[in-house]
Amino acid sequence: FNISGCSTKKLLWTYSTRSEEEFVLFCDLPEPQKSHFCHRNRLSPKQVPEHLPFMGSNDLSDVQWYQQPSNGDPLEDIRKSYPHIIQDKCTLHFLTPGVNNSGSYICRPKMIKSPYDVACCVKMILEVKPQTNASCEYSASHKQDLLLGSTGSISCPSLSCQSDAQSPAVTWYKNGKLLSVERSNRIVVDEVYDYHQGTYVCDYTQSDTVSSWTVRAVVQVRTIVGDTKLKPDILDPVEDTLEVELGKPLTISCKARFGFERVFNPVIKWYIKDSDLEWEVSVPEAKSIKSTLKDEIIERNIILEKVTQRDLRRKFVCFVQNSIGNTTQSVQLKEKRG
């Protein structure tokens, strides 16, 4: 289709080479009252109804995205050619940063409902650059945490080094929805609820003598509980003795509950005590078996190919640790009688 009638928007993505970050493009198709470029300008006034209702902002889940190759080749369907770009309704998600994402992206409705809708499309010229200087040492992260039940704030990474007074007007979106009243470089959240978790986008306009473009950053906001004040507790094994059959294989499971920590480095390991000696056992990797907002249950098994007489004289110890402290639970094997 002819893209010369598309409205054009220029966007800049300056990504940090130090962190993982995502980016999004919204299919900003015009609403009915802004639909002056959603129909062919060549039509005579007699042929053009006074109001040309475009498909309307409620129908934007069904749009098609293309990339325009720089060599002038035909438009490419995003879904077929770019695995690191995902379409979700009318939003295009870039999962990995890189200058190779620079280019022109076009979106238009899949269903052309009338001949006037043919040129109803938006062309987004995206320029992607790595952040060059570390002029702002403490710029806000693209991953921000909000503590449930307390007051918090969400900062626009590309503007977090500017004071509120010198900051330009910012446009914020939450999960693709415009937050019309939020206009500063920082959103204050009076009281944090689960509701506040999501993908936030902040845009501001930057201009030079030649043109202006939208600088965009994406912030993933997570709502969290406060760091635990407790050391982990061992849920299993509960008993300190275990009846076993000699010569048979045996798996002993250690399950421990770790309270939430923002910087989470759980330790769960097995070691063996034999008289005065003790050594750590090489066992399968630990696995998370349940994760909630407040805590996580992690399991790690010790596997004996067959229980020997020597194993009955040993203690098998599960050791778990977080930043607060550690807990141990030892198990003595006992031969089954009868």
Partner: antibody
Framework: EVQLEESGGDLVQPGGSLRLSCAAS?????????MCWVRQAPGKGLEWVAC?????????YYASWAKGRFTISRDNSKNTLYLQMNSLRAEDTAVYFC????????????WGQGTLVTVSS | DIQMTQSPSSLSASVGDRVTITCQAS??????LAWYQQKPGQAPKLLIY???TLASGVPSRFSGSGSGTDFTLTISSLQPEDFATYYC?????????????FGGGTKVVIK
């Protein structure tokens, strides 16, 4: 008993100023409530004026028409909400209600009985 | 500011009638909408919050529905004590649950 009681309503000349108070009892201001002012002109509908968050952020929110002329504030130690009204006009004549907004629902679950402000020469 | 548009501005009905009042927000407010009832000389009383949750002590003949920009308050069988003025209100402001703009009100009068 949990209640809100407004005071300070009066007859004032156009261009004048007035400060309304709202005393809360039976609950603590420092809890996570939005304390707000709503007004109702004689025979007209409800009109939101302003809110202040009683928690730590102390954020304030105003209807666009109220910005600049009206100032909402609070004194947590006195459990009292205030509305400072400057450059008053005839169209500010109304019953001013104090109301409490609750948590994550944002609705007004507690209202005062209102205080009448009359702006007239 | 968000604008809330309520219709009709008044309606006349009889006891036992089913009454429907609509409210439209100027932008998407998800389900952050409350409905109030006000009688002459009294402060408003909360009926419904979060678009469809009945406030404590409110009779089940009152119900609310809708999300996004379009909302409805329904009284399934009008009772004599229901003749009053009803208001909708937006209860989200940006990302905060701040009670703010009201609709213009709907006066329910006896036919």
């Amino acid at each position: 008993e949990v209640q809100l009681e407004e005071s300070g309503g009066d007859l004032v000349q156009p261009g004048g100023s007035l400060r309304l108070s709202c005393a809360a009892s039976g609950f603590s201001f420092s809890s996570s409530y939005y304390m707000c002012w709503v007004r109702q002109a004689p025979g007209k509908g409800l009109e939101w004026v302003a809110c202040i968050y009683a928690g730590s952020s102390g954020s304030t929110y105003y209807a666009s028409w109220a910005k600049g002329r009206f100032t909402i504030s609070r004194d947590n130690s006195k459990n009292t909400l205030y509305l400072q009204m400057n450059s008053l006009r005839a169209e500010d004549t109304a019953v001013y209600f104090c109301a409490r907004g609750a948590g994550s629902n944002g609705d007004f679950n507690l209202w005062g009985q209102g205080t009448l402000v009359t702006v007239s020469s | 500011d968000i604008q809330m548009t309520q219709s009709p501005s008044s309606l006349s009905a009889s006891v036992g009638d089913r009454v429907t009042i609509t409210c439209q927000a100027s932008e998407d407010i998800e389900s952050y909408l409350a409905w109030y009832q006000q009688k002459p000389g009294q402060a408003p009383k909360l009926l419904i919050y979060r678009a469809s949750t009945l406030a404590s002590g409110v009779p089940s003949r009152f119900s609310g529905s809708g999300s996004g920009t379009d909302f409805t308050l329904t009284i399934s069988s009008l009772q004599p004590e229901d003749f009053a003025t009803y208001y909708c209100q937006c209860t989200i402001y940006g990302v905060n649950f701040v009670p703010n703009a009201f609709g213009g009100g709907t006066k329910v009068v006896i036919k």
